[in-house]
Each structure stands twice: as C-alpha cells, then as structure tokens.
C-alpha cells in the first residue's frame, strides 16, 4: 500500500491556444486529468488500472501552481494504491479548458483539450523526487513525481507491514526495511520480552519490565544470586534454595544444637582445658590449684589437712608448711619426742605405749582421728559422692557437687538425659549407661535424627517447560521455578503463544 | 489423550456475561491441568485463565476480577464464567488440557465469543 505523488510546477501556454490551434475565449483556463496505470511500451488508451485524478481549474494559459492546495485541490496530487508497487508504470497527464464551471468529461466539448503527454518507465519507492519536463509545439509542462508508502507499510515494494507499539504484544518501532526495532529494554521476536537489571540471574531472576529483576522462590538478593536457607536455619547457609549447611561446630536440622559449645561459651575458668562431649556438653580438665565443674574454685592445699599432731597449716606458693606443736617434729609434723607419761592423746583418745616406751599411739573415740585424736573425721575422706562427685566440707555436715548428668545426696541417681527430647523430629530416646540413643523415624537420621534422609521430591521431574525444581524441606513437597512464559504449579501453562505457533 | 469440546460461546452485548464449557473424555480427568486461552485475529493465542494441577488457579491481568474458571471432575468439564465483558475480549476461546506425566497439551476446536458495543 502507497501513494503516487504528482507535483505539477509550471504550464505555459503562451498562444492560449486549444490542441487544435484555436484559440481559447477569453484565455485557456486549465486543469488536468491524470491517469495511472500498469507499465506498457506504448501507452495507449484504456483503463487506468492505478488510478485517475483531476484538478480543478489551476490558472489561465501560462502559470505556476503552488506548492499545497490550489482552488481547493491538491498539489502533490495523490494517487493511493493497495497493492505491491510493482517498480514500472504508466503516466497520462491532460490539459484541458474549462469554458464554464462543469469539469465533468461529459460535459466538455472534445476540442477543449490542451495538450497530453504520457510517459512510462521504472519508478523505485522513495522520498526523492523525479523532475521532467515535457515540451509540445505549442506548450510545455513541468512536473516532478515520486512513489511512498502508505502509513505502517515499508519495504522496496511498500509491502510490509508494520505498525509501532508499546502494549503487552509489543514494544517496537518499524525500520525501513519494515522490520521491528526494539525499544529500549525489549528483545525478541516481537520485542515482548523485558531486558531485566543488568546482572540479573539467568534462571533464578526474572522481569516484567524492563531493568526490573524479580526472584523466583527460594532466591533473594539485587540480582536474585542469594539462595534463601531453610527457614529457621539459624548458623548455616545454603548453596541451593531451602538447603541448611551448618557452619562449623554447629549440627542439627536447623544448625541450631551447639557441637562446639567450648569455643562459643568458653566455660571452664582459670586456664582449664575445654573438651566438647557432645551437643551443649563439655568437661574441663583444672589446672593444680583449681577444681568445680568449670575449675572456677580455687584449691587451697591445706583444704586436706595434712598437718598431724595438732600442726598447723599455712599455705604457700609453691605449696604448704606445717607449724608443728612443742614434741612434733617432720615434714606433717609426723614425728613426736613424746611418750604416754606426756598425755599426748587429745579428745579423750587413749595412749599406748610401743617400742619399749620409746614411740605411743593413741586410739581414738569415734569422729575423731589423726596420730594424737587430734582432728575431727573429715567425712570426705571415705569419698561418699560417686560418680565423679565433689565432696565438700560444711562443718559438721558434708555436701556433694555433682557431674553433669548426675544428682541425689551422693551423685548416685543418674539424671536422665532423654529429659530434655534431645530427640528431633519425633525419635525416640533411650538412656544408656553412658548417654543416650535416638531411634529415629523414616525418612531421618543422624545422633540426635537431625538429618534428614526423606525421597527427593523432585524425583519424579514434576516441572514441565525446563522449569527448576526444589523440595522444600519442611513439607516435602517441590516448588517449580518457571521459566518467562509460562505459570502453573508446574510451569504447565504457556501464557502466550504466537500467531505463528505450530499447532 | 483427551478429547475436548467447547460450547457456550456466542454474541453479548459489552457488560454482558456469557459462561463457557468443555467437555473432556477420558476417565483421568480430574489429574489433568485444565485452562481457557483466547485467540484474536492477526494476535497471539494468550492464556486466560487455568486451574493447575494442585487445583491453584491463575488468571490473565486483564480479565482479574471479572472472569472465574471452575472444574466438575465427576462430570469431566471446566467451565469459564466470564462478566462485565469488554469489545476486547472479543476472540476464539479455547479449551486446553495439561497431561500430569508428559506435560502434552491438548486443544479444543475453539468457540467464538463476539462482544458488540
């Protein structure tokens, strides 16, 4: 589809003769038929397969026509066509006297004719004029023409067609050759498809518009480069949606159970060495001078009252030193220059000589003890508290501090360590002698049944359309990440398909 | 593979409603992905509405609102009720199935919807 343009310039007349030699009265007042038609050889009479176009009276004899509308026709004049311009054609132009006011062929006298040229030739579309110039006895004509297309028509034929647009099927504007031209943002086909950030993942990103980047689930970040953890995942990270992986010293489903509590909780006091014995568990080992549960008391060495016969104890440094009472001598005041006629024997303890009178023991009443039943009994001594207890001295009573895991007067009741469902989903605890044991139910596994070992949900390949599957696993179930074009559970649904799709 | 054929399609004026219906054959109906796509001349065919295979529904941005689509798995049909329907909307309505093992759809012949202003 396109117009044939005729731009009529100059006519002169100078005689104001008629074609056939008669003069016109007053003057020629002249317009013009146009005929377009089909190329031939020799253009000759018939229809005017392109088109016809008349003027009204443009001026008398000789004259210049102007450029836009003259007398209220038009000047270029327009021959439109609806077809594929075929490159050749024919022109006809007449000049014809208007003696009274009816242009009507009919209603002219056959001798009011002018003049006629008619011309032929090949005419390629574009902007550029042709200027001619066409000369008879007694007239000359000039005149310039050009071939365009149509509005949304392009191409050497004005046989394409194609309109801009900017909606939901496209947005693009149309090259010469008729071919789209993407608006900035757009690419493919039809130019439908937003160009998304730059830097936007490929597959885990995506956009309804241009510079947008939108995450599919599982995905977070600028760029939907970040995979999102499991939730509750509280020290780990992930390389793919959904995924735990513990960071070190952490272990559980949700890395939550503290495997290292040593290094984060630095439990143990006074420069003990820490030893993690499972999860939130540990045991310090004391450096000499030190004991409790986290070696956070301080030994005094004469807490074991090793000074005998009535000696007393200081501390020191680098150890002790024991003042021996008059008669005692030795490194614990061991040794006595005493004898029975002494009454060496303190607490209502009786003396017996040894040795011919040279040496004595004394034997004492009950809660009393040492080489002169000179000490209270230390009921520490026969070690009361089991299981790795520590016995203390409160005056006249005793008192046990027990392990972990351990409790009762003497640390003899095992506390049990399934209290606490160390257990994770739904296994079940059994105590042992030296801790616990989880059985686990299907699909986990693991000390504690923090791993889980359930069937892949994304097995069976449940997305369609080279969506990606994930398995979320808190409901093992999948999700689908659906490629740009396509929604559904399943990334079954192509949202739109092109006229052109192969049904 | 299912067999699909519409029905309901017709002339309504603009604000008008009209209910489309496909009916399937095949006893595995109800594990079939089951959507309404539309085709305009000289324009692509668009979805317009589908139930998923979870029973999750999805629906073009521009018929929200006022088109609803709804299965009956004993009687093997999906149905479209479309309201307050624009000249726009004007086009070939197909019936589209999902198989749940190989993703291969399955078209209707299609039924015209004409709405006049």
């Known amino acids: 589809s396109g117009v044939f343009q005729l731009q009529l310039q100059e006519f002169i007349n100078e005689r104001g003769v008629l074609a056939s030699g008669r003069p016109c009265e007053p003057g020629c007042r002249t317009f013009f038929r146009v005929c377009l038609k089909h190329f031939q050889a020799v253009v000759s009479p018939g229809p005017c397969t392109f088109g016809t176009v008349s003027t009204p009276v443009l001026g008398t004899n000789s004259f210049a026509v102007r450029d836009d509308s003259s007398g209220g026709g038009r000047n270029p004049l327009q021959l439109p066509f609806n077809f594929t311009w075929p490159g050749t054609f024919s022109l006809i132009i007449e000049a014809w006297h208007a003696p009274g006011d009816d242009l009507r062929p009919e209603a002219l006298p056959p001798d009011a004719l002018i003049s006629k040229i008619a011309i032929q030739g090949s005419l390629a579309v574009g902007q550029n004029w042709l200027l001619d110039e066409q000369t008879s006895t007694l007239t000359r004509l000039r005149y310039s023409y050009r071939v365009i297309c149509s509005d949304n028509y392009y191409g050497d034929n004005c046989s394409r067609l194609c309109k801009k647009r900017n909606d939901h099927f496209g947005h693009y504007v149309c090259q010469p050759d008729g071919n789209l031209s993407c608006l900035p943002g757009w690419t493919g086909e039809y130019c439908q498809q937003p160009i998304c950030l730059s830097g936007c993942h490929e597959q885990n990103g995506y956009c309804s518009k241009p510079a947008e980047c939108l995450c599919r689930p599982g995905w977070q970040g600028r760029l939907c480069n970040e995979c999102i953890p499991h939730n509750g995942c509280r020290h780990g990270t992930c390389s793919t949606p959904w995924q735990c992986t513990c960071d070190e010293g952490w272990g559980g489903l949700f890395c939550d159970q503290d495997l290292n509590y040593c290094t984060h909780h630095s439990p143990c006091k006074n420069g003990a060495t820490c030893s993690n014995s499972g999860q939130r568990s540990y045991t310090c080992t004391c450096r000499p001078g030190y004991t409790g549960v986290d070696c956070e008391l301080e030994l005094s060495e004469c807490d074991s009252n090793p000074c005998r016969n009535g000696g007393s104890c200081k501390d020191q440094e680098d150890g002790y030193h024991c003042l021996c009472p008059p008669g005692y001598y030795g490194l614990h005041c061991e040794h006595s220059t005493l004898s029975c006629a002494d009454s060496p024997c303190f607490n209502g303890g009786s003396c017996r000589e040894r040795n011919q009178g040279a040496n004595y023991a004394c034997e004492c009443p009950p809660n009393f003890t040492g080489s002169n039943c000179e000490k209270k009994v230390d009921r520490c001594t026969s070690n009361p508290c089991a299981n790795g207890g520590q016995c203390l001295n409160r005056g006249p009573s005793r008192m046990c501090r027990c392990r972990p895991g351990f409790t009762g007067t003497y640390c003899e009741l095992h506390v049990s360590d399934c209290a606490r469902n160390p257990c994770a989903h739904g296994g079940t605890c059994h105590d042992l002698e030296n801790g616990l044991m989880c059985t686990c139910p299907a699909g986990f596994s693991g000390r504690r049944c923090e791993v889980r070992t359930s069937i892949d949900a994304c097995a069976s390949s449940p997305c369609f359309n080279r969506a990606t599957c994930y398995t979320d696993l808190s409901t093992d179930t999948f999700v689908c990440n659906c490629p740009y074009g396509f929604v559904g559970s399943r990334c079954e649904f192509p949202v739109g398909l092109p006229p052109s799709f192969p049904w | 593979e299912v067999q699909l054929v519409e029905s309901g399609g017709g002339l309504v004026q603009a604000e008008g409603s009209l209910r489309l219906s496909c009916a399937a054959s095949?006893?595995?109906?109800?594990?079939?992905?089951m959507a309404w796509y539309r085709q305009a001349p000289g324009k692509q065919r668009e979805l317009v509405a589908g139930i998923s295979f979870d029973g999750s529904t999805h629906y073009a941005e521009s018929v929200k609102g006022r088109f609803t689509i709804s299965r009956d798995d004993a009687k093997n049909t999906v149905s479209l009720q479309m309201n307050s329907l624009k000249p726009e909307d004007a086009a070939v309505y197909y019936c589209y199935s999902v198989h749940p093992s190989t993703g291969f759809g399955s078209w209707g012949q299609g039924t015209q919807v004409t709405v006049s202003s």
């Open positions: 095949g006893s595995t109906f109800s594990t079939y992905a």
